[in-house]
């Protein structure tokens, strides 16, 4: 049904949805902070802009009887379910915040007329790119593909000189929502991923694992795998490791990399990290004080969403726009506008685009060091360290089939 | 003694390319911090990019998605890749060090500065 819109005669209202399953364990009273703490930053630059108007959200919490898993996977109803409370109080604003979880967005998304902008702090998963309407402020599985092709098929780098066209991929189906999301889209035999290498295989159990990291006859010497430190370690533990196997750690929204005092463990040795680079000030407001580095991330994609809503707002304001139009809800995206933490680019298809990082561990120091970034935004490699201090043969990574070696020079398709 | 040295300045037509190279000797530039700053004719100095001790690279907005840093720690030096140049990159660049007390921050203060080389950008 046709609901009316909280939108006009200066005042604008964010309908944000407060759902009981969501990508990160989050106490919802964290994002209401989070997003509390950006209406008063939409506020003062509305002001500032000579826009008297006024801007405020409206949380909408799911019936937590119904919907109380806090797990993603069963999450595909409960987004519907909202907008039908929505529906029924003839309660809608401008702009939709939230879900976050990939099912429930997908489900929104195909059953009900998006005429206004959705905003999401997750729906990492493949379903949910090309979305017109459909802004992601978290990086979504399509730009974690986009980098490794990309660096598989880099040789011309002093650490990199072989192109790689192989790869394992360890998922065990126990994941965080985002890995879950990352390792499916890798999976998935149509995506890039898979059309761009030779050989992929998805090792299922710890053991699967464990034979590959000293088996002569594995078919790669590569495998990704998505967590954290201590993910790894539970399953690798102190076990032997050949010496041209490479473990591609994908850890994006985890900061304890960037911590001054923090010492690679032993295991990280043959381990590259892929995160994500940190703002270049430090959170050190309200709503992220007592937050760990990865709900940081997630409260402040919350965050950032009222703030893309308040510069969206500002453009159409000044611009003599009508708020409550098809335009105003496909206009979320190609566009930077300020975020909390300095500037925030959005992709043609309105998902934020970010600089990635990957570390190794010296052996010199056992200090996680910048081996390279990658700007998402210009699908471009950009090496940092040019003499790292690897474990691997001679500083350089190994190419990813053992005993390949004339052939390193030429890219595989 | 501690020493950096810059070099690989010049002219160049606007949208065209420089790679700045600062050569340290007396320290290992490794654990140190490293930023490019620059002068204009008649401006103050103002910070470009800067490599935190650890690796990770901070730009000025100015410069950001044109201006890359590397840094080559068997021969210590570190590189300033400069793309789509514009007239108002002209100015002298300097590169300057600090002994890190972060290894993820930029230092509020460089202790080590090297004599600049200077950049023209003009058709």
């Known amino acids: 049904s046709q609901v009316s819109q909280n939108c006009h005669n200066g005042s604008y209202e964010i309908s944000v949805l407060m759902m009981g399953n969501s990508a990160f364990a989050e106490p919802l009273k964290n994002l209401e902070d989070a997003v509390n703490e950006g209406l008063e930053i939409v506020r003062g630059r509305l002001q500032n802009a000579g826009l008297n108007v006024t801007v405020n959200a409206t949380f909408m919490y799911s019936d937590g009887l119904i919907h109380n898993s806090g797990d993603c996977r069963s999450s595909t109803c409960e987004g519907l379910d909202l907008l039908r409370k929505i529906s029924n109080a003839q309660r809608m604003g401008c702009v939709l915040i939230g879900p976050s979880c990939t099912y429930s967005t997908f489900q929104m998304y195909l059953d009900t007329e998006l005429s206004y902008p959705m905003i999401s702090a997750g729906s990492f998963g493949l379903s949910c790119d090309y979305k017109e309407t459909l802004t992601r402020l978290m990086s979504p599985a399509r730009k974690l593909m986009y980098f490794l092709v990309n660096f598989w098929k880099t040789n011309d780098l002093p650490f990199k000189t072989y192109s790689w066209s192989t790869s394992y991929v360890y998922k065990n189906g126990t994941e965080t929502e985002d890995c879950f999301w990352y390792l499916n889209a890798l999976e998935a035999s149509v995506s890039y991923f898979s059309h761009e290498l030779g050989f992929k295989v998805v090792l299922r159990q710890d053991k699967e694992f464990q034979d590959i990291l000293m088996d002569h006859n594995r078919k790669s010497n590569v495998i990704i795998m998505c967590g954290g430190p201590e993910f790894l370690y539970k399953l690798k533990g102190d076990r032997a490791v050949a010496e041209d196997i490479v473990i591609i750690l994908v850890d994006l929204f985890n900061d304890q990399y960037f911590e001054d005092n923090v010492t690679a463990p032993d295991y990280m040795k043959n381990v590259l990290v892929l995160t994500l680079s940190p703002g270049n000030s430090l959170l050190n407001s309200s709503f992220s004080r007592n937050l760990s580095p990865t709900k940081r991330d997630f409260a402040l994609a919350y965050l950032n969403g009222i703030l893309l809503f308040g510069h969206m707002l500002k453009i159409f304001l000044e611009n003599g726009e009508n708020i409550t139009t098809p335009k105003f809800a496909h206009a979320f995206r190609n566009l930077t506008f300020e975020g909390y933490d300095g500037p925030v680019t959005l992709d043609d298809w309105g998902d934020v685009d970010s600089t990635m990082v990957l570390l190794y561990t010296s052996v010199d120091t056992k200090k996680y060091k910048v081996l390279l970034t990658y700007d998402t935004h210009v699908n471009k490699t950009y090496p940092v360290d040019m003499s790292p201090t690897f474990t691997w043969k001679n500083s350089k990574l190994p190419n990813d089939i053992t005993g390949r070696g004339p052939q390193h020079h030429h890219h595989h398709h | 003694e501690v020493q950096l040295v810059e070099s690989g300045g010049g002219l160049v037509q606007p949208g065209g390319s420089l790679r700045l190279s600062c050569a340290a000797s007396?320290?290992?530039?490794?654990?140190?911090?490293i930023g490019w700053f620059r002068q204009a004719p008649g401006k103050e100095r103002e910070g470009v990019i800067c490599?935190?001790?650890?690796?990770?690279?901070k730009y000025a907005d100015s410069v950001k998605g044109r201006f890359t840093i590397s840094r080559d720690n068997a021969k210590n030096t570190l590189y300033l890749q400069m793309n789509s140049l514009r007239a108002e990159d002209t100015a002298v660049y300097y590169c300057?060090?600090?002994?890190?007390?972060?290894?993820?921050?930029?230092?509020?203060?460089?202790?080590?500065w090297g004599q600049g080389t200077m950049v023209t950008v003009s058709s």
């Open positions: 300057a060090a600090s002994g890190a007390t972060s290894r993820w921050n930029c230092p509020p203060q460089y202790d080590h």
């Open positions: 007396g320290f290992t530039l490794d654990d140190y911090a």
């Open positions: 490599l935190t001790s650890g690796g990770l690279p």
